[in-house]
Interface confidence: medium
């Protein structure tokens, strides 16, 4: 991260401050999309009253974007031409290439629970028969 971005008010992992992690993350699961197209990556945290202080979107070990409670959205410079914030706390990937195939993680940093992580696997297909996985919007 050779640039200034909002602070990640969270840690990662399980539980915090002596609290029990009651929340669950619902994701779009395994999805596929066509090369050149776009896809929405979406996660939703439920069943917890913990304060969400930041959501990080990562591809393997690369930061794609963050949405910080204090500072709003920041898209990583290396992805700014192909990544759009939203809808909600989700992320839209555009101009997909086969190299975009892989695991994506939404990381919800919360207090006092700690960090909740959701996993999405995206397959970018050459053919035009790609079937998009189920999608949902954050209310």
């Amino acid at each position: 991260y050779p640039y200034d971005v909002p602070d990640y008010a969270g840690g990662g992992g399980s539980g915090g401050g002596g609290s029990m992690m009651t929340g669950t993350i619902e994701t779009t699961g395994n999805i596929s999309a066509e090369k050149g197209g776009s896809i929405i990556l979406q996660c939703h945290l439920s069943s917890t009253t913990a304060q969400v202080t930041q959501v990080n979107w990562e591809q393997q070990d690369q930061a794609l974007a963050i949405c910080n409670a204090d500072l709003g959205w920041h898209i990583s410079p290396s992805f700014k031409d192909r990544v759009a914030p939203g809808p909600g706390l989700g992320l839209t990937l555009q101009s997909l290439t086969v190299n975009d195939t892989g695991e994506y993680f939404c990381i919800y940093h919360t207090y006092p629970d700690g960090t909740y992580t959701g996993r999405i696997f995206l397959e970018v297909l050459e053919s035009s028969v790609a079937e998009h996985g189920a999608r949902f919007q954050i209310p």
Epitope: D4, D7, G11, G12, G13, S14, Q51
Partner: antibody
Amino acid sequence: EVQLVESGGGLVQPGGSLRLSCAASGFTFSNFGMHWVRQAPGKGLEWVAFISSGSSSIYYADTVKGRFTISRDNAKNSLYLQMNSLRAEDTAVYYCARMRLDYYAMDYWGQGTMVTVSS
Amino acid sequence: DIQMTQSPSSLSASVGDRVTITCRASKSISKYLAWYQQKPGKAPKLLIYSGSTLQSGVPSRFSGSGSGTDFTLTISSLQPEDFATYYCQQHNEYPWTFGGGTKVEIK
């Protein structure tokens, strides 16, 4: 170059108060969460308090909760720790530290300021 | 709170030695562990975060591994400037806690 410079330490009697300051330079202070960490003489490190970039998230160690207050002034690139009802066990070097961009690890630290609580 | 236990508390080694320090968490912290180096009278310096990611500017002879509860810091070939005290810190959850430290001394 990132620089963090603490000040405000000194000798104070038990029950007294002290206000520590941390002057930040070399980075966009308003974009980073900040920590205070202390180290008693000859002992290990103890996390004290955290404040997020816009002050919306503030957390304290149980040992200082209700006595210490962390705050920041982004316009002045400054971090503060107001310490009240000081006890002998608060004697330590107090460091301000910048939170890494992505996790609660601390990537830059000041040189520390010594706080001695003694009668 | 999560307790972090480091071992050994001190060790003696020679320049060129391979040194291993371990850190154990009282419960799972996923991969979220940092390692710091501190020299006498100086502030700590971040070496490793998220278990195995090397902080920018830190020599590659330092490496971290582990997940869950057991973690290791390895110095592949000890250099004169590496004699210091090393601390682990869990950055998994509030409150963030440190290990007691491991002092690496010259044999």
